[in-house]
């Protein structure tokens, strides 16, 4: 039976949401010894490297100079070592931003809170959009996906410290393709806790609201900043 | 309908203790924050603090922070605040108030008043 | 703290005529900025949410406008159960803060 080699990694600089008109590098990370990558986009051939010397090499990037709504979409790759292919990357989902129109995001009660209060944040855009997406800055992303017809509600429900932090939304015009992001929102979560059965850095979000809670595993692999790339995207699976 | 029955009134004397409790019904207590605002005869408002019943999380004026001490009781719903080391100042109506992104429903107040 | 000052302190206005009251954040708060209404002897009551979104039960008279450090109420016509004072308060940052409030009589 024919083995294949282990995946790759596959992720993009700075980052995978990359506004309009503007640089990405998609890197893909294999083995020493590869004679060739292959990225592929939308299940197709888009690219191929082969480095130079294969045996003190074990990444390949390519480079897309000018953004756009053609180049948005889901990224693998594969790598040979002589004839033998890896496994595929996962999925890498570069999403082009700054289309359109600019959302506004607002939190409620207030951006400063008492720890346990219920808080919930709405990001508005007015151009025809259904969904909406609520991000948190950091090296765990949260990604909260939320629909409406003009606003989407995302409640966080009670929240602890762990929640402190700026957050910003953008509306969706198809998976890959995303509004400005709104101007950021910092949350303050204050308050002395007597008697919690919440732990303070353990956010617990409501199974049916939050899409994934997302922190990576190939954290050794990767970059501090290649980190939300490699997690966060997972939302759009 | 939301109500919040506050208790009644107390005459206190300087550098004694004080504790006014507030009992909630028509909602569920442990899903708002309460707070407590505090009213001198023929002045503003003044916010004092507020807790979170579900875990407990207190958040404190500063000008109060060591004097005041806001406690609540899920299986009453009734939220207390305790005011020690009264001063003739301290003379005023204090209000529980629900934060439901405003403070929309309000107790009907408790006038303490301090006086030697 | 946010300081939040409200002007004028004292507005006398005739019945079914128009009042304005302002209310001035020290910094920007947004439309975190909540109104209340308080008549002699009882607590205050909510009449406008964020700056400018109406409360259920609240005649629709009443209305807010505003956004950053400037904000306003406004009761179109003035019906005689509306002399009263009115607070501001600030929603975006503990501590929470009021406005020293604004007396509306009757002129």
């Known amino acids: 039976q024919q083995q294949t080699l282990p995946k790759p990694f596959i992720w993009a600089e700075p980052h995978f949401m990359v506004p309009k008109e503007k640089q990405v590098t998609i890197c893909c990370q294999g083995n020493y010894g590869a004679v060739e990558y292959q990225l592929h986009f939308e299940g197709s051939l888009f690219a191929v490297d082969r480095p130079k010397p294969p045996e003190r090499i074990n990444k390949v990037q390519f480079y897309i100079p000018d953004m756009n709504s053609r180049m948005a979409g889901q990224y693998s790759c594969i790598y040979r070592v002589g004839e033998l292919w890896s496994e595929p990357s996962n999925l890498l989902d570069l999403v082009v931003t700054e289309m359109y129109d600019t959302p506004t995001l607002s939190v409620h009660p207030g951006p400063e809170v008492i720890s346990g209060e219920k808080v919930t944040f709405y990001c508005r855009l007015d151009t025809a959009t259904s969904m909406f997406l609520l991000l948190k800055e950091g090296r765990s992303s949260h990604v909260q996906r939320g629909y409406g017809k003009v606003q989407a509600e995302f409640p966080l429900g009670p929240v602890t410290t762990a929640h402190r932090g700026t957050y910003r939304c953008f509306g969706s015009y198809n998976n890959h393709a995303w509004s400005f992001p709104s101007e950021p929102v910092k949350l303050l979560v204050t308050g002395d806790i007597e008697n919690t059965s919440l732990a303070p850095e353990d956010p617990t979000f409501p199974a049916d609201t939050w899409g994934t809670y997302l922190l990576t595993t190939e954290t050794g692999l990767q970059k501090d900043h290649a980190l939300w790339d490699h997690t966060a995207q997972n939302l759009l699976r | 309908q939301v109500q919040l029955v506050q208790s009644g009134a107390e005459v206190k004397k300087p550098g004694s203790s004080v504790k006014v409790s507030c009992k909630a019904s028509?909602?569920?207590?442990?899903?708002?924050?309460m707070h407590w605002v505090r009213q001198a005869p023929g002045q503003g408002l003044e916010w004092i603090g507020g807790?979170?019943?579900?875990?407990?999380?207190?958040s404190y004026n500063q000008k109060f922070k060591g004097r005041a001490t806001i406690t609540a009781d899920k299986s009453t719903s009734t939220a207390y605040m305790e005011l020690s080391s009264l001063r003739s100042e301290d003379t005023a109506v204090y209000y529980c108030?629900?934060?439901?992104?405003?403070?929309?429903?309000w107790g009907q107040g408790t006038t303490v008043t301090v006086s030697s | 703290e946010i300081v939040m000052t409200q002007s004028p302190a004292t507005l006398s206005v005739s019945p079914g005529e128009r009042a304005t009251l302002s209310c001035r954040a020290s910094?920007?708060?947004?439309?975190?900025l909540h109104w209340y209404q308080q008549k002699p002897g009882q607590a205050p009551r909510l009449l406008i949410k964020?700056?400018?979104q109406s409360i259920s039960g609240i005649p629709a008279r009443f209305s807010g406008s505003g956004s950053g450090t400037d904000f306003t109420l406004t009761i179109s016509s003035l019906e005689p159960e509306d002399f009263a004072v009115y607070y501001c308060?600030?929603?975006?940052?503990?501590?929470?803060?009021f406005g020293q409030g604004t007396k509306l009589e009757i002129k």
């Open positions: 108030a629900r934060r439901g992104g405003s403070f929309d429903y």
């Open positions: 028509g909602y569920t207590f442990s899903e708002y924050t």
């Open positions: 807790i979170s019943p579900n875990i407990g999380g207190t």
């Open positions: 910094q920007s708060i947004s439309d975190y």
């Open positions: 964020y700056a400018s």
């Open positions: 308060q600030n929603g975006h940052s503990f501590p929470l803060t």
